[in-house]
């Protein structure tokens, strides 16, 4: 199947991907165009053409050319300058600022907490199944199977540290070799990048914001996939990670370290442990083929227990099972012996919501999954809104310049490496790459950080999470110290190798180009984002898993033709874009194939048919929520609540009302003027920094 042409251009002319758009201009009746598509639904529109806008300012200015969609939006100032304010206005402005900061930190706190609860929810829903993936004996001989198990388990439990710790305990108890563990670690690295991709989906409401956010999130995915694509075969052929880490581990003089510092967890744990607490050992026990663990609940009930060793009389099948002949006796029917038994005395119950409900793990998991996703979504929306109202004027300019500007020549190349260090440092502080990259995603979306800058920050985040793992390894008990350190180092060197591959030379920064390509497609066909997520994190790994279980002949039989077709398509695509004259006329484009094999349009039509019936209920809900939001934020009455509310938009447009919700950074004054609603700014309106 040929690729869709949209993949080709990372930064095409917007007219190519914003259907029906030519240039940015005021909305005027246009007889020439019969239909217009602003979304993935095909609704016939007569007389008027809805054009995508990037700022309400352009609605009342002379026509301008559409900017490159990847350029950051101009964060316009909508308030009175500090110098023009009276004392009351200044005090009010300061309090507004403090209030916003408190709100921002509050929502950020709940955002991080919801990520933690989301991870717990995934573990409750899929943790036991994930544990069973590990108990597959084929992992030893099949690195590809190890890789997909790493991906699937991490996706199911939403935590690479959980899957890594399972691998560590399996290596420590000789159930797994370090060689077999390396592909699993690589897979865990891929799996952990799903979190920020899910977070990016929350910004689906605005095309340009979603384009940036989704590309910013998937740059992490592409880096990990590409690294594995190159480094897994290299590792299988040379075992360089195993050898290098073995040498390092052997040169260490081991002493059990202190516990790895819990930095962000110190703040979030008091809250998250009131929601739910899990017994993580259960997943590890399942992975290690412990039959008793399969019936255990992951939800922790007893938090304070007393373990005591006592000698107990136990029955044994025969004298051969006696601990020693002198410690064996009979009651005339059964044979008894003395055994050292550790018994757990439950002292105090945990203090979380689900402790007394005795619900099955799946039920608790689903409840938490829904709640955490709602909180995550709500917090994200509010963070974006607050940031939007704060990051205006000179504040925005300063922040954007600080983050996105390079060092002066000749040290410009160092900027990216500093960003890598910043990413690593920040991840070390928050103790989770998922949290850091998820927090980065909305900032990319609203245009504070460019993808080019987000890329090294994300790479740094990958390094940061491995340094945390190394510290944790150094603090682990003697029996697991060696194996956990070696695995943590494998993880570290894998990420270092990946950075060396895909960062130093600008030409090799493929993940950026691929992410931008995907961002463009996803902005145009938003369903494709979910499609991508399902294919890359579930379908492909599950297919490889299934084929691997069927054995090498089946895997090779299916895999080789697929890989061959992919390479053929890529070569053809390269020739089409670079030197099409080399190719016969028929192969210079994809038109020789059926439309559904080289364009998403037919698929879009099919999906629109299926999603159509759900759009109106969604729209109503959306509109109610949006109206409430608009009242709180002081938005205009004609707020464009949802892209699926086309009937509303068209009705208003027919009356000559420009339908456009003010973007987070749009000039509210201008958009109000457009609606004949201009109010004199008073001391209560937006405040701007000096």
């Amino acid at each position: 199947m040929a690729p869709w042409p949209e993949l080709g251009d990372a930064q095409p002319n917007p007219s190519k991907y914003l259907e029906g758009a030519t240039s940015q201009q005021p909305i005027t009746p246009d007889k020439s165009k019969e239909t217009n598509k602003t979304d993935n639904t095909e609704v016939p529109v007569t007389k008027f053409e809805l054009l995508p806008t990037y700022s309400t300012a352009t609605l009342i200015e002379e026509p301008t050319e559409v900017d490159d969609p990847w350029n950051l939006p101009t964060l316009q100032d909508s308030g009175i300058k500090w110098s023009e304010r009276d004392a009351k206005g200044k005090i009010l402005c300061v309090f507004q600022g403090i209030g916003r900061l408190i709100l921002l930190l509050g929502f950020l706190y709940f955002f991080v907490c919801s990520l933690d609860v989301l991870s717990s929810a995934f573990q409750l829903v899929g943790g036991k199944m994930a544990g069973q993936f590990f108990s597959n004996s084929s992992i030893m001989s099949n690195p590809l199977l190890g890789l997909v198990i790493g991906v699937l388990v991490t996706v199911f439990v939403q935590s690479s540290s959980t899957s890594t710790s399972i691998v560590v305990s399996m290596v420590a108890s000789s159930l797994l070799t370090v060689r077999a563990a390396i592909p699993i670690i690589m897979g865990a690295n891929i799996g952990t990048s799903i979190t920020n991709t899910i977070v990016a989906l929350m910004q689906v409401g605005d095309r340009s914001e979603f384009r940036r956010a989704f590309a910013g999130a998937t740059v992490h995915d592409f880096f990990n996939w590409l690294s594995v694509l190159v480094l897994l075969p290299v590792e299988v052929a040379t075992h360089y990670l195993e050898v290098v880490t073995q040498l390092i581990v052997e040169s260490f003089h081991f002493k059990n370290g202190e516990d790895a510092p819990d930095l962000l967890k110190v703040i979030t744990k008091p809250f998250t442990k009131l929601i739910v607490q899990l017994d993580k050992k259960v997943i590890s026990q399942i992975a290690m083929n412990d039959e008793t663990a399969k019936n255990k609940s992951l939800v922790k009930i007893w938090c304070k227990t007393f373990t005591n060793m006592t000698q107990m009389n136990v029955t044994v099948p025969s004298m051969a099972n006696c601990t020693s002949p002198s410690l064996c006796w009979t009651d005339g029917i059964q044979i008894w012996t003395m055994k050292n038994v550790t018994y757990k005395e439950n002292i105090a119950k945990c203090q979380h919501i689900f402790v007394n409900f005795h619900l099955p793990d799946l039920a608790v998991g689903i409840i938490l999954l829904i709640i955490s996703l709602l909180v995550l979504c709500g917090c994200l929306i509010m963070i974006v809104k607050i940031l939007g109202s704060v990051l205006k004027g000179q504040v925005a300019t300063v922040i954007k310049k600080t983050i996105n500007t390079d060092f002066p020549f000749p040290f410009a190349w160092l900027t990216g490496y500093l960003a890598i260090l910043v990413g690593a440092g920040m991840t070390f502080i928050v103790q989770s790459s998922s949290v850091f990259t998820s927090a980065l995603t909305p900032l990319i979306g609203i245009g504070v950080i460019t993808i080019e800058r987000a890329y090294p920050l994300t790479l740094g985040s990958n390094i940061g999470t491995t340094t945390t793992a190394i510290l944790a390894a150094l603090a682990s008990p003697g029996n697991t110290l060696r194996s956990s350190l070696q695995i943590a180092l494998c993880h570290f060197f894998f990420n270092i190798s990946g950075i060396l591959l895909w960062y130093p030379i600008p030409f090799t920064r493929l993940p950026i180009r691929m992410a931008k390509g995907l961002g463009n497609i996803s902005a145009k066909y938003r369903w494709f984002a979910i499609f991508y997520l399902i294919i890359f994190f579930f379908l492909i790994p599950l297919t490889v898993f299934g084929l691997s279980l069927a054995g090498w002949p089946v895997l090779v039989g299916v895999g080789v033709p697929v890989v061959f077709i992919i390479i053929l398509v890529l070569c053809l695509r390269l020739l089409q874009s670079r030197c099409p004259r080399v190719l016969p006329k028929k192969l210079q484009n994809w038109n020789f194939l059926p439309l559904c094999m080289h364009s998403l349009k037919p698929w879009d039509a099919v999906i629109s048919k299926f999603t159509g019936p759900f759009q109106m209920p969604c729209c109503c809900c959306c509109r109610v929520c949006c109206r409430v939001c608009c009242l709180l934020c002081g938005c205009p009455k004609c707020c464009r609540c949802s892209k699926c509310c086309q009937d509303l938009e068209e009705g208003q447009e027919a009356q000559g009302v420009p339908v456009k919700a003010p973007e987070t950074f749009d000039n509210i004054t201008i958009s109000r003027e457009a609606q004949g609603e201009v109010r004199a700014p008073d001391s209560k309106t937006e405040c701007t920094a000096l």
Partner: antibody
Framework: QVQLQQPGAELVKPGASVKMSCRTS????????MHWVKQTPGQGREWIGA????????SYNQKFKGKATLTADKSSSTAYMQLNSLTSEDSAVYYC?????????????WGQGTSVTVAS | DIVMTQSHKFMSTSVGDRVSITCKAS??????VAWYQQKAGQSPKLLIY???TRHTGVPDRFTGSGSGTDFTLIIRSLQSEDLADYFC?????????FGSGTKLEIK
């Protein structure tokens, strides 16, 4: 209190069989193992076997397998021992006894014993 | 089967004496040994189990000791009501086996 009641004496002909009872009271019948012990002036005391009334599980001294059969009736809280193909060597006092010290074979309650005489 | 041997069939004693009754097992029985007292015309009565644990209601003048193969029952200060037959039992292996008994008589 715990009581094990056995019939005082049984007179049987050689080759015949006898089924002696041990009626219990004062405790939960199905809880403890019921042991049977044979006592003769010449041979001393010999353990015949034991039954766990709760499940009907039995254990025999190899010497008495085929000779003795142990049963228990939960409804009447009574244990039985049947001795087959009696000979003069089977003449003895037979005790039923229970061990309430659960995991041990030390028997702490004994019946009064049934004196079996095998004579023609 | 494990054979429990009580070397003395009879022991002549006086009231107030310290009496030691011995029992030897043919193989290691750990501490799975019990001691019984049987008076003429009566059923046996448990005195000691687990070699040295006194059964409820047994006077403290009765003590047991030993392990492995050699076991002893000691009556610290013999009373007239203690004149009876004393036998040991092992419950280390099936079948349970008893000693032949030691009868205490007045000199």
């Amino acid at each position: 209190q715990v009581q094990l009641q056995q019939p005082g004496a049984e007179l049987v002909k050689p080759g015949a069989s006898v089924k002696m009872s041990c009626r219990t009271s004062g405790y939960t019948f199905i809880t403890y193992n019921m042991h049977w012990v044979k006592q003769t002036p010449g041979q001393g005391r010999e353990w015949i076997g034991a039954i766990y009334p709760g499940s009907g599980d039995t254990s025999y001294n190899q010497k008495f397998k085929g000779k003795a059969t142990l049963t228990a009736d939960k409804s009447s809280s009574t244990a039985y021992m049947q001795l087959n193909s009696l000979t003069s060597e089977d003449s003895a006092v037979y005790y039923c006894s229970i061990s309430t010290i659960i995991t041990t074979g030390a028997v702490d309650y004994w019946g009064q014993g049934t004196s079996v005489t095998v004579a023609s | 089967d494990i054979v429990m041997t009580q070397s003395h069939k009879f022991m002549s004693t006086s009231v107030g004496d310290r009496v030691s009754i011995t029992c030897k097992a043919s193989q290691d029985v750990g501490t799975a040994v019990a001691w019984y007292q049987q008076k003429a015309g009566q059923s046996p009565k448990l005195l000691i189990y687990w070699t040295s644990t006194r059964h409820t209601g047994v006077p403290d003048r009765f003590t047991g000791s030993g392990s492995g193969t050699d076991f002893t029952l000691i009556i610290r200060s013999l009373q007239s009501e203690d004149l009876a037959d004393y036998f040991c039992q092992q419950y280390s292996r099936i079948p349970l086996t008893f000693g032949s008994g030691t009868k205490l008589e007045i000199k």
